[in-house]
């Protein structure tokens, strides 16, 4: 029997390599069976998680899984981080793992480095 | 059941590069990371690195930097290792093994592919 | 990177002992998500390593019962309560919190 709990599914240690001045759309996949729940974006900020208020959300829908969606138009430096997505089902608090972006300034970088290299070579990520 | 094939293994020549292959079958493996692992003959476990098969990111770890390259083709349900500037040291069973991305509710090895690296 | 130490690094044992396997790691094994990725591995000669536990405790399907984990921080145990004949193996523990992922030396345990 297929479960009817809510779950979110962004992978743990997931990443992305994404450049300043890009739009870029941040997804939380979301499982739902009956009432698609209320679902929230939140930044870490050490161990706290703030929820992100006043910013362009929007649901996409596919066949067998939602799509909660952050639009950064366009992406900041400051959005450098980690963010996690909540769900609200049921009175409880369904939390996925983070998520981290990791923004270049291409400003600062005179080509656009490779993911690999953005792993790698911290230095060009802002912290 | 996932199940996990390894093939590329044999015999190479110092300095030459080899591609092993690991495919997937009984999981979408864009669900998953998928990783290698090597075992030098009588030794323990060394982790080579590790990739998002949904985005192509990787992890390695620090000596296999810029001579390890792993990537995968989702559609195939295929991860590579490919390995430049061999060494005799490199000779080891390589594993490569997939878990779940979300909850870590499996995690499955391949049977092994051993890579002799030898003149 | 995290050092992971294994003790003993090899150990005799009859069938139906209790037998205990520690682990210990140079730093905190425990996430932001407030969970310790500590995995243990059995292997067998010539044979793929195996997944026992996983997040310190948690069984994998299939494993017998008579296998545990337990730990937190930095010190972290595998336990089998009455060893069986195909127990005999090397068993390794490994951390998947932090990147690079490392593993202990192994500890093989042999028939007394």
């Known amino acids: 029997k297929e479960s009817c709990d809510v779950q979110l599914y962004i992978k743990r240690q997931s990443y992305h390599s994404i450049f300043a001045g890009d739009p870029f759309k941040l997804e939380c996949p979301v499982k739902y069976c009956a009432h698609r729940p209320q679902v929230t974006w939140c930044k870490l900020n050490g161990t706290t998680c703030v929820k992100l208020e006043g910013r362009h959300t929007s649901w996409k829908q596919e066949k067998n899984l939602s799509f909660f969606i952050l639009h950064f138009e366009p992406v900041l430096p400051s959005d450098n981080g980690s963010y996690r997505c909540s769900a609200n089902f049921l009175s409880a608090i369904i939390e996925s793992h983070s998520t981290t972006l990791y923004v270049t300034d291409v400003k600062s970088a005179s080509e656009r480095p490779s993911k690999d290299e953005m792993a790698s070579r911290p230095w060009l990520l802002y912290s | 059941e996932v199940q996990l094939v390894e093939s590329g293994g044999g015999l190479v020549q110092p300095g030459r590069s080899l591609r092993l292959s690991c495919t997937a079958s009984g999981v979408n493996i864009k669900d998953t990371y998928m990783y290698w692992v090597r075992q030098a003959p009588g030794k323990g476990l060394e982790w080579v690195g590790r990739i998002d098969p949904a985005n192509g990111y990787t992890r390695y770890t620090a000596s296999f930097k810029g001579r390890a390259t792993i990537s995968a083709d989702g559609s195939k349900s295929i991860a590579y290792l490919q390995m430049n500037s061999l060494k005799t040291e490199d000779t080891a069973v390589y594993y490569c093994?997939?878990?779940?991305?979300?909850?870590?509710?499996?995690?499955?090895w391949g049977q092994g592919t051993l890579v002799t690296v030898s003149s | 990177d995290i050092q992971m130490t294994q003790s003993p690094s090899s150990l005799s044992a009859s069938v139906g002992d209790r037998v205990t396997i520690t682990c210990r790691s140079s730093?905190?094994?425990?996430?932001?998500?407030?969970?310790?990725?500590l995995n243990w591995l059995q292997q067998k000669p010539g044979k793929a390593p195996k997944r026992l536990i996983y997040?310190?405790?948690k069984l994998d399907s299939g494993v017998p019962s008579r296998f545990s984990g337990s730990g937190s921080g930095t010190d972290f145990t595998l336990t089998i309560s009455s060893l069986q004949p195909e127990d005999f193996a090397t068993y390794y523990c490994w951390q998947g919190t932090l990147f690079p992922r490392t593993f202990g030396q192994g500890t093989k345990l042999e028939i007394k």
């Open positions: 997040l310190v405790s």
């Open positions: 730093q905190s094994l425990l996430d932001s998500d407030g969970k310790s990725y």
């Open positions: 093994a997939v878990y779940d991305g979300y909850y870590e509710s499996f995690d499955v």
